[in-house]
Amino acid sequence: ASNFDCCLGYTDRILHPKFIVGFTRQLANEGCDINAIIFHTKKKLSVCANPKQTWVKYIVRLLSKKVKNM
């Protein structure tokens, strides 16, 4: 659920980390209405996720460690 590069809502699906290649943080105080994590998938999809949810925080941590280790 995104419009003009801003997420307007969150996915109701859970993405498995193996399908995600990166993420972008969307901040509500930087021109968009809500905070969000935008996951980028191997199939070139962008998926808006709720940054409060544990599965989202978990994958963000996984990806952050991957980037650091590269």
């Epitope: 859970i14 498995h16 980390p17 193996k18 709720n50 409060k52 949810q53 544990t54 599965w55 989202v56 925080k57 978990y58 994958i59 963000v60 941590r61 996984l62």
Partner: antibody
Framework: QVQLVQSGAEVKKPGSSVKVSCKAS????????ISWVRQAPGQGLEWMGG????????IYSQKFQDRVTITADESTSTAYMELSSLRSEDTAVYYC??????????????????WGKGTLVTVSS | DIQMTQSPSTLSASIGDRVTITCRAS??????LAWYQQKPGRAPKLLIY???SLQSGVPSRFSGSGSGTDFTLTISSLQPEDFATYYC?????????FGGGTKLEIK
């Protein structure tokens, strides 16, 4: 409420490894993050790492990431924590703990509320 | 990583006293803060989650407050069974981090 049953106390030599198990019963296993927390004698609590069983890939605290391996077996509802290259400073009680809410909860207040009784690992030559 | 600083490290009090323990986060964590009680030889017990929500079965003399970086745990009237060590935990982000603990002793 879920019950977490941990394996028994271990005495290990410096340089060796230890593997502690944590079996969950009475709740959904794969929808909750399991954390491993350690407590050295007279010291505070330290989060070592965790795993969402469905994801299989664990996450670790920077302090432990080179020596710890966390896994989960969904078929037996059991999580494992293996610590290698043991030294005397690793003598501690190791706890497994399960999040209060499942990984899809929209507020994400994890605050583990189910804990194992702890496994004492003593490292001594 | 988010650091949690807890104070005091030791607190002496008497039965019936009102006591307050504080926890400060190195960065804003909204209300993603939990409080635990631990007695010797036992696993930690969750008292408060979401900074101020009382965990089921926990006596109402325990209360939590705060948001952002500064949090407090208050015990309104100390009971004999409350003498223990208390820890805060931030669950805003991974890695989860605990405060150093506050040992509550009998004066």
């Amino acid at each position: 409420q879920v019950q977490l049953v941990q394996s028994g106390a271990e005495v290990k030599k410096p340089g060796s490894s230890v593997k502690v198990s944590c079996k969950a019963s009475g709740g959904t296993f794969n929808r909750y993050a399991i954390s491993w927390v350690r407590q050295a004698p007279g010291q505070g609590l330290e989060w070592m790492g965790g795993i969402i069983p469905m994801f299989a890939t664990p996450i670790y605290s920077q302090k432990f990431q080179d020596r710890v391996t966390i896994t989960a077996d969904e078929s037996t509802s059991t999580a494992y924590m293996e610590l290698s290259s043991l030294r005397s400073e690793d003598t501690a009680v190791y706890y497994c703990a399960r999040d209060r809410t499942d990984y899809y909860d929209t507020d994400g207040y994890q605050s583990p509320d189910s804990w194992g009784k702890g496994t004492l690992v003593t490292v001594s030559s | 990583d988010i650091q949690m600083t807890q104070s005091p490290s030791t607190l002496s009090a008497s039965i019936g006293d009102r006591v307050t323990i504080t926890c400060r986060a190195s960065q804003g964590i909204n209300n993603y803060l939990a409080w635990y009680q631990q007695k010797p030889g036992r696993a930690p017990k969750l008292l408060i989650y979401a900074a101020s929500s009382l965990q089921s079965g926990v006596p109402s003399r325990f209360s939590g407050s705060g948001s952002g970086t500064d949090f407090t745990l208050t015990i309104s009237s100390l009971q004999p069974e409350d003498f223990a060590t208390y820890y805060c935990l931030q669950d805003s982000d991974y890695p989860l981090t605990f405060g150093g603990g506050t040992k509550l002793e009998i004066k």
